[in-house]
């Protein structure tokens, strides 16, 4: 851009150097050259000479008009053709920008990742503005009425040390740029309700060599939260649909989850947890890939072919609808909750 140009005259922009994208724009060039009565005044945009919509207003001034200017940034300069000079003489230059006023920030969410020491707030910024847009995050204590403000570009991390005077806060985000200002809706936050447990990690998996092979997945977390509710989702690498199994977890020891899976198949596992009864989930853990062993018996059971009873304990029973079955013939199979649609939530989808 042109920030430190020595002008021999002036250049100005109507409606201004930063304007709303799609507006009609007039750029004026006024020369104040010594020993020159210019034959012509020329405009350049991004180094290219402009040919159209140029008007000579008087001896010293010319104007170029743009209909519906829609480039986010351009640098303009103008020159004079002075008699007796081989080269054009620079008069002045200006950076111009077009963009949009900000949308009201939406989907404001604040969480505290366990052990992070920060409250992290994120929001949707809306459509691109194309110009410098800042976000002011307001954090107001509902107990002391004190308000703190933080400048951000897309998210903010606020040290929990600065939130020690209170547990309940009102949070909102103000979007500001040269063309306007908008506020998000206010979010009520209780610090005890927004903690996300320390990351859950699948450490290993093994498939037993039984008649009906069983896969055991081992997973852990360093969380200090006592009551944790978790989901593990899994699928073959060739499948689009996840099955989800739910657990009440106690991380004082490594968790073990059992699955009866198709033999000789590559499975992807992911886990996520939340404090029981709270709203915010961890992101899904990194994908853990496990290859089940080849079939030894003749059984070929497909886990997505039968109805399941939904339970939130560590096992879910597969039962048949006919009551004539003798109890000893009822097979207990490990939990697969098939929800009939891909598992949703904040996750990185695999496959």
């Amino acid at each position: 851009g042109i920030t430190s140009i020595n002008c021999s005259g002036d250049m100005w922009v109507e409606p201004g150097e930063i304007f709303q994208m799609g507006m009609n724009v007039s750029i004026y060039c006024q020369e104040a050259l010594k020993h020159c009565r210019p034959r012509n005044l020329y405009f350049y945009k991004n180094g290219f000479k402009e040919e159209f919509d140029i008007t000579r207003i008087n001896r010293t001034t010319a104007r170029i008009w743009y209909k519906g200017f829609s480039e986010p940034h351009a640098y303009m300069h103008c020159t004079a053709e002075c008699p007796g000079h081989f080269q054009e003489t620079l008069i002045c230059g200006k950076d111009i920008s077009s963009g949009h006023p900000p949308d009201a920030p939406s989907n404001l969410t604040c969480v505290i990742y366990e052990y992070s020491g920060n409250m992290t707030c994120t929001w949707n910024t809306g459509k691109p503005t194309y110009i410098d847009t800042k976000y002011i995050v307001h954090v107001k204590s509902l107990e002391t009425e004190e308000e703190q403000q933080y400048l951000a570009s897309s998210y903010v991390k606020i040290s929990t040390d600065s939130l020690q005077g209170s547990r309940k806060y009102l949070v909102w985000v103000q979007a500001v740029n040269s063309l306007g200002m908008e506020n998000s809706q206010q979010l009520h936050v209780h610090l005890d309700d927004i903690v996300i447990p320390s990351a859950s990690i699948i450490s290993r998996a093994e498939t037993t060599n039984d008649t009906v092979p069983k896969t055991i997945v081992y997973w852990k977390s360093k969380t200090m939260i006592e009551k944790v509710f978790c989901e593990m989702r899994y699928k073959t690498t060739t499948n689009q649909t996840w099955s989800v199994k739910e657990f009440d977890a106690n991380f004082t020891y490594v968790q073990q989850s059992e699955f009866y899976l198709e033999p000789d198949s590559k499975y992807v596992f992911q886990v996520r947890c939340q404090e029981t009864g709270k709203r915010n989930w961890q992101p899904w853990s990194s994908p853990f890939v496990h290859q089940t062993s080849q079939e030894t018996g003749k059984r070929n059971w497909q886990p997505w072919s039968s109805p399941f009873v939904h339970q939130t304990s560590q096992t879910v029973s597969q039962v048949t609808a006919k009551s004539s079955h003798e109890p000893q013939k009822m097979e207990m199979l490990s939990a697969t909750i098939f929800r009939g649609h891909p598992a949703s939530g904040n996750h990185q989808d695999i496959g």
Epitope: E147, Q148, Q149, Y150, L151, S162, M181
Partner: nanobody, 116 residues
């Protein structure tokens, strides 16, 4: 109660520099975002610049690249460094709590006059 005292204004030629100060008391300065606003003769209040408690800054387009806001938490003082001054920067300058807004809380202000 909250007290803000501006100083450092004066008469300066176009292209010159000044450093404004704002001494603050009566609140936890290190946790508080601050701003500068100004009022030119016969005009309304205009927001100039803001800074949050961590030192992130924001500027009005008219002063971007020429003015620098900063704060010294140890001294409970807010600063505004004014460089490459223009005649249109002539105004009464006020400091206030909060990053953004074209109001101030009734402090006395400091006068900046840019003239040749």
């Amino acid at each position: 109660q909250v007290q803000l005292q501006e100083s450092g204004g004066g008469l300066v030629q176009p292209g010159g520099s000044l450093r404004l100060s704002c001494a603050a008391s009566g609140f936890t300065f290190r946790l508080t975002a601050m701003r500068w606003v100004r009022q030119a003769p016969g005009k309304g209040l205009e927001w100039v610049s803001g800074i949050d408690s961590r030192g992130s800054t924001i500027y009005a387009d008219s002063v971007k690249g020429r003015f620098t806001i900063s704060k010294d938490n140890a001294k409970n003082t807010l600063y505004l460094q004014l460089n490459s001054l223009k005649t249109e920067d002539t105004a009464m300058y006020y400091c206030a709590q909060g990053v953004y807004g074209d109001t101030h809380s009734g402090s006395q202000g400091t006068q900046v006059t840019v003239s040749s």
